[in-house]
């Protein structure tokens, strides 16, 4: 099977399997350095389910600013550039990890938190409920 | 005006503005308890730019498993259920925070890392480059 090596130079911890409190280095390593930063910046406008980005700021959270998508229309944009209400613009949501200051207003103590954010919108066929 | 509180019960830290190493409680608090997790689970199939979800696993990362979207088609699904190549299915990407074990294989020491993940797909009008 797969053996998971353990580094002898690790800091001490009481529970080796699932530590409750860990040390985290906040000097962020960015794995996205090779990506083209312009790559998806205009999809919000060119999409058949276009969206706007709204600021969600919470100083007690890290990152404190998250830009959230809100679909511009209930329907989707058709080939003529009009809104087609036979289709639906819906937000694509993702659960992400953030750090929440705990106790509040503390600069160096956090708790891991999961929040749901809307990243963009997609055009879907509506679910039609037929009345008997 | 805005007053910025500071909790006197905070653990000590050397740099109050941008600490390098912080304590993080891994007992995750989930803010999404009132949301229906199934709410957007079928969009990947109903979208005019449908996608599949692929497993991305890395035991040295927390969370170790991330599901990544890959668009099923280059084009988008039209009203007849066929792929229309005059439109493009594109991935909506988001930068997310993860914890990377550092030093490697250590259970209680991490570094914050930003990675780019594809969350879903949207249908966009293509950029047409006219040749002079």
């Amino acid at each position: 099977g797969i053996t998971i090596p353990r580094n002898p130079g690790c800091p001490n911890s009481e529970d080796k399997n699932f530590p409750r409190t860990v040390m985290v280095n906040l000097n962020i390593h960015n794995r996205n350095t090779n990506t083209n930063p312009k790559r998806s910046s205009d999809y919000y406008n060119r999409s058949t389910s276009p969206w706007n980005l709204h600021r969600n700021e919470d100083p007690e959270r890290y990152p404190s600013v998250i830009w959230e998508a809100k679909c511009r229309h209930l329907g989707c944009i058709n080939a003529d550039g009009n809104v087609d209400y036979h289709m639906n613009s819906v937000p694509i949501q993702q659960e992400i990890l953030v750090l929440r200051r705990e106790p509040p207003h503390c600069p160096n103590s956090f708790r891991l938190e999961k929040i749901l954010v809307s990243v963009g919108c997609t055009c879907v066929t509506p679910i039609v409920h037929h009345v008997a | 005006g805005i007053t910025i509180p500071r909790n006197p019960g905070c653990p000590n830290s050397e740099d109050k503005n941008f600490p390098r190493t912080v304590m993080v409680n891994l007992n995750i608090h989930n803010r999404n308890t009132n949301t229906n997790p199934k709410r957007s689970s079928d969009y990947y199939n109903r979208s005019t730019s449908p996608w599949n979800l692929h497993r991305n696993e890395d035991p040295e990362r927390y969370p170790s498993v991330i599901w990544e979207a890959k668009c099923r088609h280059l084009g988008c699904i039209n009203a007849d259920g066929n792929v229309d190549y005059h439109m493009n299915s594109v991935p909506i990407q988001q930068e997310i925070l993860v914890l990377r074990r550092e030093p490697p294989h250590c259970p209680n020491s991490f570094r914050l890392e930003k990675i780019l993940v594809s969350v879903g797909c949207t249908c966009v009008t293509p950029i047409v480059h006219h040749v002079a």
Epitope: N27, N30, N32, R55, E57 | I2
Partner: antibody, heavy 119, light 107 residues
Framework: QVQLKESGPGLVAPSQSLSITCTVS????????IHWLRQPPGKGLEWLGV???????HSDSALMSRLSISKDNSKSQVFLNVHSLRPEDTAIYYC?????????????WGQGTTLTVSS | DVKMTQSPSSMYASLGERVTITCKAS??????LSWFQQKPGKSPKTLIY???GLVDGVPSRFSGSGSGQDYSLTISSLEYEDMGVYYC?????????FGAGTKLELK
């Protein structure tokens, strides 16, 4: 202390491209978002775009097809590139940092660099 | 895009006078509003953030208020160094958008 300084070519001919550099000191680009703004002569301020700490960008849709923003964290430099320049792009170009101790806002601005688009 | 309507476009005021400049957003901007002061040949200087937060080092005679779509900047007692152009900026939605500016001159 925190400083931002823009540098550019000064004079550029119409239809040409330009690159303006914003060199920062006193903080790391890894941790801060940088915005680009401009001000045509005798007119108001206009937001052009932002490069977030992680390197992704967002720009005004009216300019998006002609504008790109990038950065080099190790050199503490942010770059604004505009192609197919027009006389109406003549302006003072500014970079500004989004920072703050609690809430974030545009807390530091560069002194600006003047661009003239003329033949 | 969020349109910011700033008024007045210009005004004359006397030293010691109370001055108020307003900005109205086309949408609710959730108090994500800043005020800037700009003097000729200089870059803008941030005075107020989050509608009512006073930037460190800015004199207390400056104050901001408002919520939803309506915001204002007040100078409680005008001083000579306050002459210049004032701008509001909404940063609730991308793209960020500015008001057209208010030129404040001495009466």
């Amino acid at each position: 202390q925190v400083q931002l300084k823009e540098s550019g070519p000064g004079l550029v001919a119409p239809s040409q491209s330009l690159s303006i550099t914003c060199t920062v000191s006193g903080f790391s680009l890894i941790n801060y978002d940088i915005h680009w703004l401009r001000q045509p002569p005798g007119k108001g301020l206009e937001w052009l775009g932002v490069i977030w700490a992680g390197g992704r960008t967002h720009s005004d849709s009216a300019l998006m097809s002609r504008l790109s923003i990038s950065k080099d964290n190790s050199k503490s430099q942010v770059f604004l590139n505009v192609h197919s320049l027009r006389p109406e792009d003549t302006a003072i170009y500014y970079c500004a940092r989004e920072g703050g101790d609690y809430y974030k806002y545009l807390d530091f601005w560069g002194q600006g660099t003047t661009l003239t688009v003329s033949s | 895009d969020v349109k910011m309507t700033q008024s007045p476009s210009s005004m004359y005021a006397s030293l010691g006078e109370r001055v108020t400049i307003t900005c109205k957003a086309s949408h609710d901007i959730n108090s994500y509003l800043s005020w800037f002061q700009q003097k000729p040949g200089k870059s803008p200087k941030t005075l107020i953030y989050r509608a009512n937060g006073l930037v460190d080092g800015v004199p207390s005679r400056f104050s901001g208020s408002g919520s939803g779509q309506d915001y204002s900047l007040t100078i409680s007692s005008l001083e000579y160094e306050d002459m210049g152009v004032y701008y509001c900026l909404q940063y609730e939605m991308l793209p960020l958008t500015f008001g057209a500016g208010t030129k404040l001159e001495l009466k």
